[in-house]
């Protein structure tokens, strides 16, 4: 004989478990239906009647099959230093990520809780490691023969121009000034054949590393505690 398909609610076999998209209801002592994403349990099952599911209200969601009595609240609106990369729907929470020029200083399960402005390297310093979505810019002092005259979160140290006759020698924060009409630019640092500048190294000053400008921070407050869960919201 073919095995009979059990319809919810039903009592599981002793030591058995409920099927996918079902949960064991302790009160009814039955396997009962979970609610699909975008819905929640409005009325719990009994021995004779199944779970009643209802749609999540505005600004609330459930992402998984669940039996929560209330949908979860979507996070607060994205702050001014963030962009909304996923809207709040009945099936998913709002996701806020940091806008260009900012990085995530404090992440959360999805998106970012706290964005901070990317560090700007001041003159005499260049970007050693560019910022990413989750890490700040790392600055380094410009090595002899290179300079940066900008306050920037993207500019690297660039080589001084090569002068036939130097009017003002370059330093870490200023390019060399030539008297000749046609200066040449040396190749990027790290190139295989990096020509030495015509002017002597003693003309370059290497500043001691100093902290870059403090990043501005902007806070995105965490979402309040979630509504009570009857158990795991997983399948």
């Amino acid at each position: 004989l073919p095995a009979q398909v059990a319809f919810t609610p039903y009592a599981p076999e002793p030591g058995g478990t409920c099927r996918l998209r079902e949960y064991y209801d302790q009160t009814a002592q039955m396997c009962c239906s979970k609610c699909p994403p975008g819905q929640h349990a409005k009325v719990f099952c009994t021995k004779t009647s199944d779970t009643v599911c209802d749609s999540c209200e505005d600004s609330t969601y459930t992402q998984l099959w669940n039996w929560v009595p209330e949908c979860l609240s979507c996070g607060s609106r994205c702050s001014s230093d963030q962009v909304e990369t996923q809207a709040c729907t009945r099936e998913q929470n709002r996701i806020c990520t940091c806008r260009p020029g900012w990085y995530c200083a404090l992440s959360k399960q999805e998106g970012c809780r706290l964005c901070a402005q990317l560090r700007k390297c001041r003159p005499g310093f260049g970007v050693a490691r560019p910022g990413t979505e989750t890490s700040d810019v790392v600055c380094k002092p410009c090595a002899p023969g290179t300079f940066s005259n900008t306050t920037s979160s993207t500019d690297i140290c660039r080589p001084h121009q090569i002068c036939h006759v130097v009017a003002i020698p370059g330093n870490a924060s200023m390019d060399a000034v030539c008297t000749s009409t046609s200066p040449t630019r040396s190749m990027a640092p790290g190139a295989v054949h990096l020509p030495q500048p015509v002017s002597t190294r003693s003309q370059h000053t290497q500043p001691t590393p100093a902290p870059s400008t403090a990043p501005g921070t902007s806070f995105l407050l965490p979402v309040g505690p979630s509504p009570p869960a009857e158990g795991s919201t997983g399948d």
Epitope: F44, G224, P227, E230
Partner: antibody, heavy 118, light 107 residues
Framework: QVQLQQSGPELVKPGASVTISCKAS????????IHWVKQRPGQGLEWIGW????????KYHEKFKGKAILTADTSSTTAYMQLNSLTSEDSAVYFC???????????WGQGTTLTVSS | DIQMTQTTSSLSASLGDRVTISCRAS??????LNWFQQKPDGTIKLLIY???RLHSGVPSRFSGSGSGTDYSLTISNLEQEDMATYFC?????????FGGGTKLEIK
């Protein structure tokens, strides 16, 4: 047997505050909502709000925001409702009730009579 | 807020009668309706939830029906202990609201 035992009657002066308690027993206190309901003499029932002791989330009827404050103490399995700036309009019987889902109250306390009078 | 109206504020019936108490919502409440019994001593009990589900321990002579905006509670074979006030309550939309009550007296 599930029980919700409420505190005794209160006689308070206008402008004062009062706290009513609701002691829960014989069930898992943190897995159920506790609701508070107002009943004025000879009138219907009014839902005030709920608290979920499991995570202390509260939800209030707009009308009672600022009037009622709901709290719960999981160690003593007791829910509390504080009523502030009392007037004669607050004279009523107040019930606590529990629910597993948010909307239907399966067990009720016996009620606490509050009289506001000078 | 959703208004719940119980047009009959009181009714009297004889023991053994079949009594129906009605409740109307100001908008569709999609069967999210409960019935409560309040005894003269003030104690309140849940009888029926979600229109027709009988709460555990409630005698089977109580039943509920309805849909949309119109709902009813039926007590068949009325008993003395059924003398009480009956309230309907919607839980479709916050805030949850109650009807004004129907007081049932025994003739």
């Amino acid at each position: 047997q599930v029980q919700l035992q409420q505190s005794g009657p209160e006689l308070v002066k206008p402008g004062a505050s009062v706290t009513i308690s609701c002691k829960a027993s014989d069930y898992s206190f943190t897995n159920y909502y506790i609701h508070w309901v107002k009943q004025r003499p000879g009138q219907g029932l009014e839902w005030i709000g709920w608290i979920y002791p499991g995570n202390v989330i509260t939800k209030y009827h707009e009308k009672f925001k600022g009037k009622a404050i709901l709290t719960a103490d999981t160690s003593s399995t007791t829910a509390y409702m504080q009523l502030n700036s009392l007037t004669s309009e607050d004279s009523a019987v107040y019930f606590c009730a529990r629910s597993r889902a948010t909307g239907y109250f399966d067990y009720w306390g016996q009620g606490t009579t509050l009289t506001v009078s000078s | 807020d959703i208004q719940m109206t119980q047009t009959t504020s009181s009714l009297s019936a004889s023991l053994g009668d079949r009594v129906t108490i009605s409740c109307r919502a100001s908008q569709d409440i999609r069967n999210y309706l409960n019935w409560f019994q309040q005894k003269p001593d003030g104690t309140i009990k849940l009888l029926i939830y979600y229109t027709s589900r009988l709460h555990s321990g409630v005698p089977s002579r109580f039943s509920g029906s309805g849909s949309g905006t119109d709902y009813s509670l039926t007590i068949s074979n009325l008993e003395q202990e059924d003398m009480a006030t009956y309230f309907c309550q919607q839980f479709n939309t916050l805030p949850w609201t109650f009807g004004g009550g129907t007081k049932l007296e025994i003739k």
